[in-house]
Interface confidence: low
């Protein structure tokens, strides 16, 4: 099976003289990798190349975000004929080689996970030496990161006409839905996407008019659990005074 | 040159399982993905999953947990699916294709087996 | 999940005749990748990448589009293009298909 399209910018400087007709630079990653936080994650690649039997200096890495341009995440080296590959870059300590790049394998594992590492990661490697050649996944794969939710922030501010308005932001994958009771609630309640933070993870819902001295519960939710905290408004001459209260319940 | 070659057809029974094979012959199987598509008449085609038998990796459409697991033998270049709790809405066409997921740019399925037909009736 | 709706599911041109067939996602992705699947045959695969054909495909077939609008264009139909098209799409699981457009020959 042979593609139309030719790309260049894959395969650089391709010399090795006893290269197999077989075999070519190709990459095999899934598209997706799914993982809940906390929790680690495999991230697979494994390549083919057409430098047969080659034992010279290597070098693995993995970058997030986009290819050949995202930051390095990981790096490691392996001298001429050596099976170990040096770590020199694992950021925040937390990224480790599962596969052996000498058997073509340069498949990472991600401890302790946290919604900021739902996002893309390519790998790539390169070998140096008699033979100088690279190529790196182009695609990547995508770790998808799943979380039950958490509220991280929920207060009272003042709003117009001497009233008061509550903010309930919240985290969590799948995005949770919001909710909030109190004293003498209608539908006053709305859950509008925040302004992009957090890889589109964090959801804020705002009651508009705070009518009423009392509980205000915020709730969150999604598929994998529940999350509540509660703000007391208590106004006196004009002022407000609250304080939080929060629970988790996670669905196992 | 690149076969897939699958198991024949398939007439089971209702509640029972079935397993159906898809041998990789003309490259290194454990190079590349293998995926499995079922089809039904009228209802197009359906992923229902994957495995890299280099890694012993597997990616699963949700609909089929439970119901297809997918496994690799290296040493004789098979792909095995097993389907249980057989029921009428599992008679279909299984392919199995060999994945090429990132090669110039782009994932294909480039090679396809010719088909194995399962039959679920009492 | 990302649906794909095809349309026509059904249609019928006479040799010489340009078709387009159309392939609308639920929601944006990357590519698109089409197959050919003739009766009593396995699929194909016969555009990748949204607009690139695979080796051995005619060059009266063409792909385009973007976010959740692809076609498939046939210049000038032969008899031997009669089969059923299914678009396709990797960019998040589960991987799904089009329900197929069937291209029938007057």
């Known amino acids: 099976f042979v593609r139309t399209k030719i790309d260049t910018t894959e395969n650089l400087l391709n010399t090795e003289v006893h290269s197999s007709p077989a075999q070519r630079w190709s990459m095999q990653v899934p598209a997706e990798v799914s993982a809940a936080a906390g929790d680690a994650a495999v991230l697979p690649c494994t390549f083919t190349h057409p430098h047969r039997h080659y034992d010279g200096p290597l070098t693995a890495i993995w970058r997030a975000g986009e290819p050949y341009a995202g930051p390095q995440v990981f790096r490691c080296a392996a001298a001429r004929g050596s099976e170990l590959c040096q770590t020199a870059l694992s950021l925040h300590g937390r990224f480790r080689l599962l596969g052996n790049p000498r058997r073509n394998d340069l498949s990472l594992r991600v401890e302790r996970l946290a919604l900021a590492d739902d996002r893309r990661y390519f790998c790539r490697v390169e070998f140096a030496g008699d033979v100088h050649d690279r190529y790196e996944s182009r695609h990547g794969v995508r770790l998808h990161v799943t979380a039950a939710p958490r509220i991280i922030n929920i207060s009272v501010l003042p709003g117009p006409a001497h009233a008061f308005r509550a903010l309930c932001t919240a985290e969590g994958e799948p995005p949770p839905a919001l909710a909030w009771s109190g004293p003498a609630l209608g539908n006053g309640s709305a859950a509008v996407p925040s302004s992009g933070q957090g890889h589109g993870h964090l959801v804020t819902a705002e009651l508009p008019a705070l009518n009423h001295d009392g509980r205000y519960t915020c709730t969150a939710a999604n598929s994998l659990g529940r999350s509540e905290a509660s703000v007391y408004l208590f106004r006196f001459h004009g002022a407000s005074g609250a304080s939080t209260h929060h629970h988790h319940h996670h669905h196992h | 040159q690149v076969q897939l070659k699958q198991s024949g057809a398939e007439l089971v029974r209702p509640g029972t399982s079935v397993q159906m094979s898809c041998k990789a012959v003309g490259y290194t199987f454990t190079n590349y993905w293998i995926g499995w598509v079922k089809q039904r008449p009228g209802h197009g085609l359906e992923w229902v999953g994957d495995i890299h038998p280099g890694i012993n990796y597997t990616n699963n459409n949700e609909k089929f947990r439970g119901k297809a697991t997918l496994t690799a033998d290296t040493s004789s270049s098979t792909a095995y699916m097993q389907l249980r709790g057989l029921t009428s809405d599992d008679s279909a066409i299984y392919y199995c294709?060999?994945?090429?997921?990132?090669?110039?740019?782009?994932?294909?399925?480039?090679?396809w087996g010719q088909g194995t037909s399962v039959t679920v009736s009492s | 999940q990302i649906v794909l709706s095809q349309s026509p599911a059904l249609l019928s041109a006479s040799p010489g005749e340009k078709v387009t067939m159309t392939c609308r996602a639920s929601?944006?992705?990357?590519?698109m990748y089409w197959y050919q699947q003739k009766p009593g045959s396995s699929p194909k695969p016969w555009i990748y990448?949204?607009?690139n054909l695979t080796s051995g495909v005619p060059a009266r077939f063409s792909g385009s589009g973007s976010g959740t609008s692809y076609s498939l264009t046939i210049s000038r139909v032969e008899a031997e293009d009669a089969a059923t098209y299914f678009c396709q799409q990797w960019n998040s699981k589960p991987w799904t298909f089009g329900g197929g457009s069937k291209l029938e020959i007057r």
């Open positions: 294709a060999r994945v090429d997921y990132d090669y110039d740019g782009s994932y294909i399925m480039d090679y």
């Open positions: 990448a949204t607009s």
């Open positions: 929601s944006s992705v990357s590519y």
